[in-house]
C-alpha cells in the first residue's frame, strides 16, 4: 500500500504541492524501476485512475495536467506498466492541497471572563483557507515595551498571571499559511476595562394569579463586581422580535424581575450583563422557557373570585439546563 511508500521513482507538482485553489497544475511522474522500461505510466487521484490530460514526456516521465483544480485535498500516486510484470508497479505518491492565503484578521477582541484567570482573545479569520493556517498573537506591554507571542490555530487563552507588564497592552494577530501572511490592526486594551462578570443565570420563573397575572423571573450571578448593568430579553416563542428590559443590578441577593405577559403563551427569556460603563457584554444566557397559565374567566361572584384570583395560585418554571442560545458568542 501507500502507507509508507518506498518510491521507485519520483512524483512532483508544479507550481507546488500546496497551491491556490482554482489554479492549473501539473503533476509529473518519473519512473526509476530496475529492469523496466515502462510501457505506460498511470496516475491515480484518491484511488481513481485518471484517463485524460496525460502526456508522455519521455521514456520514463509523464505529466498529468489539471485545469482549475478546486479540491482542497487529494492523494495522488502514479504507477508503471512494466513489460514482464502482471500488476502495475507503484512509482510514488504525494498528497496535494489547494486553498487560499489568509485574510487580514479583523475584529480582534480580548476579554477576561471573571474567575477564569485568562485573557481570551478572538478574531474574525475571514474566508476559509482550506489549508493549515496558524495565527501568532502578539501582546505588547505599553508600560515595559515587552512583547510576548502566542502560536495558535484559532483563539487563544493567555493566563493573566503572565501579563506582568502592567495594565495597558497592544494586541495584534498575524495569520500565515503556505500561501501568504497577513497582520491585523493593533488593539489597545486596559485589563480593568475588559472584565466580563461571572455568567448571569435564570433559575426559575413563576406566574402569580393576582388581579392582573404577573410573572416573576428569578436570576443571579456569582460576580463580585459591584456595578453591573444587565439586559433581559424575552419574547413569545412564536415571535421574531425580542423585548428588552434594562437593569442596574447589585448581586448581593437573587434578582426578581416582574413581567406582565399574555396568558397561555410560551415565552423565552435570556439575560446578559456587563460591568457598568465597560465595553463588553456577557454572551446571552441559555434559553429559559416559561408558559403562562390560561386566564380564568372573570365573573362577578365574590366566592369565585376568592377561590381563583386571590388563591395565590402559581405556575412555575425551573431551569434545568435548557437549549443553548444561538447568540452565545454575542459579546460586542
Amino acid at each position: 500500500g501507500i502507507t509508507n511508500i518506498n518510491c521507485s521513482g519520483h512524483i512532483w507538482v508544479e507550481p507546488a504541492t500546496i497551491f491556490k485553489m482554482g489554479m492549473n497544475i501539473s503533476i509529473y511522474c518519473q519512473a526509476a524501476i530496475k529492469n523496466c522500461q515502462p510501457r505506460k505510466l498511470h496516475f491515480y487521484k484518491n484511488g481513481i485512475k485518471e484517463r485524460f490530460q496525460i502526456t508522455r514526456i519521455n521514456k520514463t516521465t509523464a505529466r498529468l495536467w489539471y485545469k482549475n483544480f478546486l479540491e482542497p485535498h487529494a492523494s495522488m500516486y502514479c504507477t508503471a506498466e512494466c513489460p514482464k510484470h502482471f500488476q502495475e508497479t507503484l512509482i510514488c505518491g504525494k498528497d496535494i492541497s489547494s486553498g487560499y492565503p489568509p485574510d487580514i484578521p479583523d475584529e480582534v477582541t480580548c476579554v477576561i471572563y471573571e474567575y477564569s484567570g485568562n485573557m481570551t482573545c478572538t478574531w474574525n479569520a475571514g474566508k476559509l483557507t482550506y489549508i493549515d493556517t496558524k495565527y501568532v498573537v502578539h501582546v505588547k506591554s505599553l508600560e515595559t515595551e515587552e512583547e510576548q507571542q502566542y502560536l495558535t490555530s484559532s483563539y487563544i487563552n493567555i493566563s493573566t498571571d503572565s501579563l506582568q507588564g502592567g495594565k495597558k497592552y497592544l494586541v495584534w494577530v498575524q495569520a500565515a499559511n503556505a500561501l501568504g501572511m497577513e497582520e491585523s490592526k493593533q488593539l489597545q486594551i486596559h485589563l480593568d476595562d475588559i472584565v466580563i462578570p461571572s455568567a448571569a443565570v435564570i433559575s426559575r420563573a413563576e406566574t402569580i394569579n393576582a388581579t392582573v397575572p404577573k410573572t416573576i423571573i428569578y436570576w443571579d450571578s456569582q460576580t463580585t463586581i459591584e456595578k453591573v448593568s444587565c439586559e433581559m430579553r424575552y419574547k413569545a416563542t412564536t415571535n421574531q422580535t425580542w423585548n428588552v428590559k434594562e437593569f442596574d443590578t447589585n448581586f448581593t441577593y437573587v434578582q426578581q424581575s416582574e413581567f406582565y405577559l399574555e396568558p397561555n403563551i410560551k415565552y423565552v427569556f435570556q439575560v446578559r450583563c456587563q460591568e457598568t460603563g465597560k465595553r463588553y457584554w456577557q454572551p446571552w444566557s441559555s434559553l429559559f422557557f416559561h408558559k403562562t397559565p390560561e386566564t380564568v374567566p372573570q365573573v362577578t361572584s365574590k366566592a369565585f373570585q376568592h377561590d381563583t384570583w386571590n388563591s395565590g395560585l402559581t405556575v412555575a418554571s425551573i431551569s434545568t439546563g435548557h437549549l443553548t442560545s444561538d447568540n452565545r458568542g454575542d459579546i460586542g
Epitope: 500500500g1 481513481i48 500488476q87
Partner: nanobody, 119 residues
Amino acid sequence: EVQLVESGGGLVQPGGSLTLSCVASGRTFSTDVMGWFRQAPGKEREFVAAHRRNGISTVYAASVKGRFTISRDNAKNTVYLGMKSLKPEDTAVYVCAAGSDASGGYDYWGQGTQVTVSS
C-alpha cells in the same frame, strides 16, 4: 446501481480504536475502487483511504497514514476502515464510496456513520 451501507461508528476516547464496515450490494462488479471519505461540521468532504480491486491496492490521505488501514473482503462485498490512535480532529461523519475508472470518480455514496473522538 450500487447500494452502500456503513456501520461501526460511535463515541471513542482519544487514542482509542474503531473499525468501520461498508457493505456493498447491487452491481458491485462495476466498481474499480471502494473508498472512505469524511466530513466534519463546516468542512469540505475529505478523502481518507481507498482500496482498488487490483493493481496498487491501497492509498491513504496524509492525515491518516500509519493510523488507518483499509481492507476489503470481496466474498462479503465489504470494505473495512480500521482506525487506531484516534484524535479529536478525526471526529466526522465517515462516508463509504464506490468508484470507477471509466467515470473518473466516485459514483455511489453511502449515508455515512458518525465517529466522535472525545474524552
